[in-house]
């Protein structure tokens, strides 16, 4: 899915209002310095691509996070604010239902959610090009003029 046409500010609002709190709840009892962030993203569509991958794709040691509260809210936000996103996810969702039986929090899952927090942080706070500035290029916010 190409996240270029999502309403980034609405997704950001959904994250700050609810998703971030669910991530904090999931990570409760874990020190913020316990994991090194190794996953990064360069712009908002790329961040959403990485967020989707880490949230919904099974990885070694962390079968799936898809039934966690933060994941369900992430899916809802993407479905609402990314045109056509829902249609692309029907097959993926069915596959996930078959693969996922129970929720188990492993250390690998905690590490993965720590990575997610870093990706969301980057998504929320890109250093966007200012008017009249040529510091660097960032094309993903062509219809969102606010820096934050």
């Amino acid at each position: 899915y190409d996240f270029t046409n999502c309403d980034f500010e609405k997704i950001k609002a959904a994250y700050l209002s609810t998703i971030s709190k669910d991530l904090i709840t999931y990570m409760s009892g874990t020190k913020s310095t316990e994991f090194n962030n190794t996953v990064s993203c360069s712009n908002r569509p790329h961040c959403l691509t990485e967020i989707q991958s880490l949230t919904f794709n099974p990885t070694a040691g962390c079968a799936s996070l898809a039934k966690e509260m933060f994941a369900m809210k992430t899916k809802a936000a993407l479905a609402i604010w990314c045109p056509g996103y829902s249609e692309t996810q029907i097959n993926a969702t069915q596959a996930m239902k078959k693969a996922r039986k129970s929720k188990v929090t492993t250390n690998k899952c905690l590490e993965q959610v720590s990575q997610l927090q870093g990706l969301w942080r980057r998504f929320n706070r890109p250093l966007l090009k200012q008017q009249g500035s040529s510091d660097y290029k960032d094309d993903d916010d062509k219809h969102h003029h606010h820096h934050h």
Epitope: K12, L16, T33, Q117, N124, R125, H148
Partner: antibody, heavy 120, light 111 residues
Amino acid sequence: EVQLVQSGAEVKKPGSSVKVSCKASGFTFSTYNMHWVRQAPGQGLEWMGAIYPGNGETSYNQKFKDRVTLTVDKSTSTAYMELSSLRSEDTAVYYCAREDDYGEGYFDVWGQGTTVTVSS
Amino acid sequence: DIVMTQSPDSLAVSLGERATINCRASESVDNSGLSFMHWYQQKPGQPPKLLIYRASNLGSGVPDRFSGSGSGTDFTLTISSLQAEDVAVYYCQQINTDPLTFGQGTKLEIK
């Protein structure tokens, strides 16, 4: 412990440059926006710019755009602010600050400040 | 640039009394239903410390006598019962639009 430790006070001549360092510890430096804020004696806070250590992207206050350069050294988790063509009005305390964990955009960790005095 | 104007410039309040500081932005700092306005406290010789984020959310470890309200262009920081340790300069900050800007500060003293 999450902290930012800045370099010591500097006295500079007008027209020269100053480079202030800010060493981070206790967090993954490369994934947080790092900001620079200055405060002239008895005055308020003024945002100078920010840098994302992950890829070196910067955003500057246009007021300082031609004179300030923000850089990072990821290997030492250190952010740098260089201000050139100094004038007496640049006499101030310069702070580095980290954005919060959650992308709210507030500055939750600050350096202790570096006093820069510009005098002939 | 968004100009942040605080009022009053200085304020003297008796211990135990309510203190109110206002901040007005030259344009809205709201985006998608959220207000991107923060409040900081600064004591002499120290860096600023976050009090309130996003207009009304209490910062970590901040006493609940502090509260924030407002949206759009008008915001208020309230200290319900002034304590001696609250003597400081208070700043509002908007982060909705570059450049990030602060209010000029309000100096709070004990009457």
